[in-house]
Interface confidence: low
């Protein structure tokens, strides 16, 4: 008896070692052979294993060896009776064959996967428990060549098998075996197979449905987004005034003689700022009052107006080209050019005003939107003004009153208020007072530029040729055109960009006025200071204030033109009387009070010598409540004056802490000096009356704390009244004070109200539609309607 292949042994490294050998001839292993084994420890017991036949000549012997360890070495002896056939040693730790994994099962899992699970053949205490890796064989029962082998090298005895990797409808079998890498073991025997049917449907079958569902979902999302945007647009965006949709007509407050489009102040270089862009950047912020707010502020310090403190950013009419969407088309409606007689040192004033209003620094573009209320007031004033002048016929001359229309001075320009360049947009009030910018950025003020003017008016203003988007007032004397018939492609001409004298980096005028004033921040301030402060300033030709005086008279009495003094057209007062003629009847305008236009007195004292009719009437009457914010004279005080010695801090970028002073300077306009008065006198006097969005007459609250004049809070229109603490200190906010010091309460009971959008002929103004109310912190009811009073008072507002 001989051993053909000596025994090879493997241990499961837990309890059993198996040795297998082959004899040289068929042998009855259990009857003829014995395998003895013992640990080679001294004194260890000798054990005997009885082999079994695996094949005819192959014998296998399983030796129960407990707790094999690396140090264990077994001495093996193969005996055939008393004959030692083979002797050798065996170290179980060096010949490991792991146990066969058990309990292989297959479970359907989520997401069309099969979960194969089996059990680790070793208890957790055994060193091999955490050493095993597995091999899983998955084969198609009907296709021997269709099989896959997966190596599971992680700890868990599981395998997730995507059903899509198997043929649908086929029967598959899986089996698993283990291997202990750290022991350089052999693979265990294969576990018994487990069979299952792969009933997975390929994803291609679901593709059409999935694509359809995806398309529907995407479509639903798109539709919801579309309708949401439409709803937002209707509810919010469409409520924002748009030059392309607004019937507003820009009123040009300008010099009466010289075209400022091409004019440069001495020592000033033109800014690289085309007129259309300048005007857009000053105008369009006014149209985005609601919702756009302070979306983009200028990153650099822009030029502040002289009265502008570090309060809030003044954004209108500051350039905001970064923020505004340019209108698709510029269809210009007729522009009213209302000018006054020339004044003395117009050139210096023009320089200073032009510097600030014509071409704001591009660096300051994108100014913050904070002046919406003032702008709305200004635009609505213009709206009402034009409605009353032209009704709905599109002309500026009321029917039957062509002779009293205001003709444009020959040299007037449409550039003084750059917003006039664009259609259906009104001027914006420059920021001031509590609404002053809190940072210097975006603080350019669109103050009116003063320029010499002439009362000759057969010649249309040069702006017509300079910018075809403009139509001078004179061009409409003999025609009545519909709004918007002007040229829609304005010529792009560079404006002289002139900086405030107080800004070091800006060019300084070589010949500043002798009494350099802190310049008012806006045309409203300028007009207010000129008209209210200087009652007796003589001026060549028509009195500087005559235009406004006539306007007021017209407002108060609505009578035919009076020849009481030189003025525009046939009469100095004709234009405004024509306006007045459209107002409710009953008001009379007996003439100008003594010492006014006839005497060349440039100041307008609306509430001095008030009589039951209007100025000049013998008996006092109730103070007119429709004052445009300019009809009353605030009590002045010397310390509030704008004298020549005014601090230069009012001329440039205002340092922090000067906001109070800035406001004070506006509270005593009577103290202004002559240069300013002369300069201001050439401007048309009007202020914002109504909210631009709702057509309601605008009334203001004021919480002026430091000014000398006490301003009485009064209701404001519902659509644009906001926090009274944030209202601008502009001419509209000037105190309505009676000559005797009695404060004028600019509010009426609702009983006297009629819609402000209705002219005497009953024609509805395009601005009478109500708009959604802004957030209000003041106590007034936001639903009040703006009205024109039918009472004999000149005008009343609520």
């Amino acid at each position: 008896v001989k051993v053909l292949h000596e025994p090879s042994c493997f241990s499961d490294y837990i309890s059993t070692s198996v040795c297998q050998w082959k004899m040289d001839h068929p042998t009855n292993c259990s009857a003829e052979l014995r395998l003895s084994y013992q640990l080679d420890f001294m004194g260890s017991e000798n054990h005997t294993c009885v082999p079994e036949n695996r094949e005819d000549s192959v014998c296998v012997c399983s030796m129960p060896i407990d707790d094999a360890v690396e140090a264990d070495v077994y001495q093996l002896d193969l005996w055939a009776g008393q004959q030692l056939l083979w002797s050798g040693s065996f170290q179980p730790s060096k010949h490991v064959k792991p146990r066969t994994p058990g309990n292989l099962t297959v479970h359907p899992n989520i997401s069309h996967t099969w979960l194969l699970m089996w059990t680790n053949p070793y208890p957790t205490e055994n060193h091999l428990h955490s050493e095993l890796t597995y091999m899983v064989n998955v084969s198609n029962d009907n296709d021997p060549e269709d099989f896959k082998v997966y190596n599971v090298t992680y700890m868990g005895p599981t395998l997730r098998l995507a059903a899509s990797t198997l043929k649908s409808g086929a029967s598959y079998s899986a089996r698993v075996r283990a291997w202990a890498q750290t022991y350089n073991s052999t693979w265990s025997d294969w576990s018994p197979s487990t069979t299952w049917l792969n009933y997975y449907e390929p994803w291609e079958q679901h593709l059409p449905l999935g694509v359809s569902i995806s398309c529907l979902v995407i479509l639903a999302i798109c539709l919801s987004c579309y309708f949401s945007i439409i709803k937002i647009k209707k509810g919010w965006w469409d409520q924002i005034p748009n030059p392309a949709h607004s019937p507003l007509v820009a009123i040009v407050i300008q010099d009466s003689q010289v075209s400022l489009w091409g004019k440069r102040s001495r020592g000033q270089e033109p800014a690289k700022c085309p007129h259309w862009k300048t005007c857009l950047t000053k105008l369009l912020p006014c149209l985005l009052e609601h919702g756009l707010g302070r979306e983009e502020e200028s990153p650099k310090t822009a030029k502040n107006g002289p009265l502008q403190g570090p309060g809030k950013p003044a954004w209108c009419p500051v350039e905001v080209s970064k923020t505004i969407l340019w209108p698709e088309s510029i269809s210009v409606v007729q522009c009213v050019e209302l000018s006054e007689a020339p004044v003395d040192n117009e050139e210096e004033e023009e320089v200073e005003e032009d510097k600030r209003s014509l071409c704001p620094s591009l660096e300051g573009s994108g100014g913050s939107f904070q002046e919406g209320r003032e702008g709305i007031v200004a635009r609505l004033t213009e709206s009402l003004f034009l409605d009353l002048l032209g009704g709905e016929n599109g002309g500026f001359c009321p029917q039957g009153l062509e002779e009293s229309c205001l003709p444009p001075p020959s040299g007037s320009v449409g550039a003084q208020m750059p917003w006039a360049q664009f259609p259906r947009a009104g001027p914006r009030a420059a920021p001031e007072g509590p609404e002053q910018p809190r940072r210097p950025e975006s603080a350019l003020q669109a103050s009116p530029t003063q320029s010499a003017g002439s009362s000759a008016f057969p010649e249309p203003p040069p702006v017509v040729t300079d910018n075809p988007a403009y139509r001078s007032f004179g061009s409409f004397l003999g025609q009545s055109s519909d709004p918007g018939d002007g040229d829609s492609d304005p010529e792009l001409a560079d404006r002289p960009g002139e900086a405030d004298p107080g800004i070091p980096s800006a060019p300084q005028p070589p010949e500043p006025p002798a009494a350099l004033q802190p310049e008012p921040e806006s045309w409203e301030q300028i007009l207010r200071q000129s008209v209210l402060q200087h009652r007796a300033a003589p001026a060549p030709g028509p009195g500087p204030g005559s235009g406004y005086r006539e306007f007021t008279c017209a407002v108060k009495q609505g009578s035919a033109p009076d020849a009481g003094g030189p003025g525009f057209g046939p009469s100095g007062e004709a234009g405004y009387k024509a306006f007045c003629s459209l107002l409710p009847g009953g008001a009379t305008c007996p003439g100008t009070s003594g010492g006014e236009a006839g005497s060349g007195e440039g100041g307008y004292k609306p509430f001095q010598s008030l009589t039951p009719g209007c100025p000049g009437a013998p008996t006092p009457v109730p103070v007119p409540l429709f004052t445009f914010g300019l009809d009353t004279e605030p009590p002045g005080s010397p310390q509030d004056s704008l004298g020549a010695g005014s601090s230069p801090e009012h001329l440039g970028v205002e340092p922090a802490g000067k906001e109070e002073d800035s406001r004070k300077t506006l509270l005593a306009p009577e103290q202004a000096t002559d240069p300013l008065r002369d300069d201001l006198a050439s401007s048309i006097v009007y202020s914002a009356l109504t909210c631009h969005l709702c057509g309601h007459l605008k009334q203001w609250h004021d919480q002026e704390e430091r000014g000398k004049a006490h301003i009485v809070p009064s209701p404001c229109c519902g659509c644009c009244c906001g926090d009274r603490s944030s209202l601008l200190l502009s001419p509209l906010r000037a105190p309505n004070v009676l000559p005797g010091g009695v404060l004028l309460e600019a509010s009426l009971s609702p009983a006297s109200l009629v819609p402000s959008g209705v002219s005497k002929e009953g024609k509805s103004s395009p601005f009478s539609q109500p708009a959604s109310s802004s957030a209000q912190s003041s106590s007034q009811t936001p639903k009040k309607l703006a009205v024109l009073s039918t009472e004999p008072t000149c005008m009343s507002a609520s």
């Epitope: 490294y13 094999a68 360890v69 140090a71 208890p123 205490e125 055994n126």
Partner: antibody, heavy 119, light 107 residues
Framework: QIQLIQSGPELKKPGETVKISCKAS????????MSWVKQAPGKGLKWMGW????????TYADDFKGRFAFSLETSASTAYLQINNLKNEDTASYFC????????????WGQGTLVTVSA | DIVMTQSHKFMSTSVGDRVSITCKAS??????VAWYQQKPGQSPKLLIY???YRYTGVPDRFTGSGSGTDFTFTITSVQTEDLAVYYC?????????FGGGTKLEIK
């Protein structure tokens, strides 16, 4: 968890026989061998021998051959130590201890059974 | 039989101290040495096997070292709960034998 629970204390007279049981739980009983350890009062540990729970083959230390016998009841996962012909020096605590897989160390121990032999 | 000798029957130490217990085999036992802890009234507990391997759940302040005939068991930072008797045992050959034990006392 793995536990080895031994039978209670025994009070015997010399010449009698005592059979101590050790019931295993928490693991596969036949996987690990079981040793028995004697600890006389105030003395150290003395290994008596072990039994293969897989094959049932016992191994005895020289000092514990003859009167001592290890046995199994695999179905009950229980190992037994039987001491015949008790002597006074047999008074001690007897522990069953399950082998560990890493070595011949004794990983789990029963709480011990005190056998008192007294005339 | 292989005799395992623990030279110190008693050792006194303080909490936080480092203490080492030695065990000497009468012959080379390679690394087949285990260490046990037996607290009063309790069963022994395996701490170290194969001379230097910590058993499952044993704190790492317990360490073992040595091979051949000299072995050392160390507690790097003694705690009060470490008061016990410590035994070494060889499992190189049967009969397995224990050392006499070293009783650790806390000052």
């Amino acid at each position: 968890q793995i536990q080895l629970i031994q039978s209670g204390p025994e009070l015997k007279k010399p010449g009698e026989t005592v059979k101590i049981s050790c019931k295993a739980s928490g693991y596969t009983f036949t996987t690990f061998g079981m040793s028995w350890v004697k600890q006389a009062p105030g003395k150290g540990l003395k290994w008596m021998g072990w039994i293969s729970t897989y094959s049932g083959v016992p191994t005895y230390a020289d000092d514990f051959k003859g009167r001592f016998a290890f046995s199994l009841e695999t179905s009950a996962s229980t190992a037994y130590l039987q001491i015949n012909n008790l002597k006074n020096e047999d008074t001690a605590s007897y522990f069953c201890a399950r082998h560990t897989f890493q070595s011949r160390g004794l990983a789990y121990w029963g709480q011990g059974t005190l056998v008192t032999v007294s005339a | 039989d292989i005799v395992m000798t623990q030279s110190h029957k008693f050792m006194s130490t303080s909490v936080g101290d480092r203490v080492s217990i030695t065990c000497k085999a009468s012959q080379d036992v390679i690394t087949t040495v285990a260490w046990y802890q037996q607290k009063p009234g309790q069963s022994p507990k395996l701490l170290i096997y194969s001379a230097s391997y910590r058993y499952t759940g044993v704190p790492d302040r317990f360490t073992g070292s040595g091979s051949g005939t000299d072995f050392t068991f160390t507690i790097t930072s003694v705690q009060t709960e470490d008061l016990a008797v410590y035994y070494c045992q060889q499992h190189y050959s049967t009969p397995w034998t224990f050392g006499g034990g070293t009783k650790l006392e806390i000052k």
